[in-house]
């Protein structure tokens, strides 16, 4: 049993079931790729499931003497036979069972050769391979500025491979990117929110373990909204909690081709209402400024009191239009502050 594989899987050798002609039971993890070959020759061998010959195409297929299951599902459990064409001799008699508690090769399994544990789980060593190549078909991503972009390279292998990302051939960690990046190693994904023209380029995932490496490249083109209203960095300003008497900084980062004008607003209540007859919120203008593109605008609140608690809005405008994002300031009595504020994360709100 082998865990499958690269885009050129037909060029790779496959592994035969351990026992020939005897019945064998293998337990397979849900979602695990399966790849079995029938004997030493690819010719004249056909796989059958529950008496029906497997087609040569599809998610579960019998192909060139191989049994291939792209991603094991509950309905794939059952009895599989490999028969020699002509004589119809049973070459392999195999029952596949699903173990829902297994989802992939465990990281601590690192056998040197094909091996079968007492429970029937088979953990061969395997170079990295793409598990969901259909999710990688869109190579060119052309997206409007301000959108979120997600690149994926879902992979597996044994030992479990690591993933690294490159931008234009250089290691990419997003330190210099407004808003940073989000990496989810379990989902093999890179996410960039609120993309801007400087994000354009070639993004390459490099997946490797001790047995080999694979890579795949995506092209990102950011379509400028020409002209467009200001773009505000995701997650700024951030919700903040402070203790009475402390100082607070609210940050707003603006991207704008045209000269942006920034206002900091505090939402207020007038006659018991937060909104006027026109439907707009009542606000107090705290600060107005013009900044250069991509600079950080900061609202400083010194020696905060309970009256400073509430909703604050960063309003950015240019000749095209307005953008705004809001955050809440919570002010606690000193004795109530029993925790520390986490570093805010980048998010984008239109």
């Amino acid at each position: 049993l082998s865990l499958e594989a690269s885009e050129e899987m037909e060029q790779e050798p496959c592994l035969a079931p351990i026992l020939e002609q005897q019945e064998q039971v293998l337990t397979v993890a849900l979602g695990q790729p399966v790849r079995l070959c029938c004997g030493r020759t690819e010719r004249g061998r056909h796989w059958y499931k529950e008496g029906s010959r497997l087609a040569s195409a599809g998610r579960v297929r019998g192909w060139r003497g191989r049994l291939e299951i792209a991603s094991f599902l509950p309905e794939d459990a059952g009895r599989y036979l490999c028969l020699a064409r002509g004589s119809m001799t049973v070459v392999h008699n195999l029952t596949l069972l699903m173990d829902d508690s297994l989802t992939s090769i465990s990281n601590d399994e690192d056998p040197k050769t094909l091996s079968s544990s007492s429970s029937g789980h088979v953990y061969p060593q395997q170079a990295p391979y793409w598990t969901h190549p259909q999710r990688m078909e869109k190579k060119l991503h052309a997206v409007p500025a301000g959108n979120t972009v997600k690149f994926r390279c879902p992979a597996a292998g044994n030992p479990m491979p690591t993933i690294h990302w490159l931008k234009d051939g250089q290691a990419f960690h997003g330190e210099n990117r407004i808003g940073g990046i989000r990496l989810r190693h379990q989902h093999w994904s890179l996410v960039m929110e609120s993309v801007v023209p400087s994000d354009r380029g070639t993004y390459t995932c490099l997946v490797e373990n001790s047995l080999g490496s694979i890579r795949y490249s995506y092209l990102l083109d950011v379509l400028e909204r020409s002209p467009h209203r200001p773009i505000l960095q995701a997650g700024l300003p951030a919700n903040t909690t402070a203790v009475v008497g402390s100082d607070v900084e609210l940050l707003c980062k603006v991207y704008s081709d045209a000269q942006p004008h920034i206002q900091w607003l505090k939402h207020v209540v007038i006659n018991g209402s937060s909104f006027g007859a026109d439907g707009f919120p009542y606000v107090q203008v705290l600060k107005t400024t013009d900044i250069n593109s991509s600079e950080v605008e900061v609202l400083y609140l010194r020696n905060v009191s309970a009256e400073d608690a509430g909703e604050y809005t960063c309003l950015a405008g240019n000749s095209i239009g307005l953008s705004y994002q809001s955050a809440w300031l919570t002010v606690l009595p000193e004795e109530d502050l029993t925790w520390t504020t986490a570093t805010p994360e980048a998010r984008y709100t239109d």
Epitope: D100, S101, T103, N147, T148, K150, R184, Q186, H187, W188
Partner: antibody, heavy 119, light 107 residues
Framework: QVQLLESGGGLVQPGGSLRLSCAAS????????MSWVRQAPGKGLEWVSV????????HYADSVKGRFTISRDNSKNTLYLQMNSLRAEDTAVYYC????????????WGQGTLVTVSS | DIQMTQSPSSLSASVGDRVTITCRAS??????LNWYQQKPGKAPKLLIY???NLQSGVPSRFSGSGSGTDFTLTISSLQPEDFAVYYC?????????FGQGTKVEIK
Amino acid sequence: QVQLLESGGGLVQPGGSLRLSCAASGFTFSDYAMSWVRQAPGKGLEWVSVIEGDGSYTHYADSVKGRFTISRDNSKNTLYLQMNSLRAEDTAVYYCAREKTYSSAFDYWGQGTLVTVSS
Amino acid sequence: DIQMTQSPSSLSASVGDRVTITCRASQDISSDLNWYQQKPGKAPKLLIYDASNLQSGVPSRFSGSGSGTDFTLTISSLQPEDFAVYYCQQHYSPSHTFGQGTKVEIK
């Protein structure tokens, strides 16, 4: 079989704190990302936070960022949500949910625990 | 944030009807969309993941389609146990926003 059991909900005053727990069984806990999703009375579902299987990645909804902290103890097969500076709008049933491998679909959910924020 | 808009917000149908619920994203989300069913007092249940994949154990009368910004959940022949609220959820961006829900009621 996979089971998720939330606990720790209850009545708390505005500005107060609560810690929710989610005990998991029936699967290899550390292999899965976990999320918290909440539902205010009579309202729709709102995703709250996610944490990767090894705890290396977390993310929060804007509405709770800076106030809530997600964490996990893989040795105890338990997921946590520390909720501080609670507001009336945080009143909801809180569900923990398991993410499918290679996806962010929640294939198993707990039964939920009710958090009521009121003075 | 990526906004998810479901339509209709509610619908009335009879057993045996073909029911279609749509979900629209505010930007391209590829196929990163899931569908859930929720009955009163119960936790949601995953029906469809990644736009079109039927979750194990879910009846085949449920199907999903779409990619990019427009998605559809179809119930080919409504059964009594299908009367519930249905939610879409995107997982393209780090914040996995849900649609506002569609209530399927008995006509």
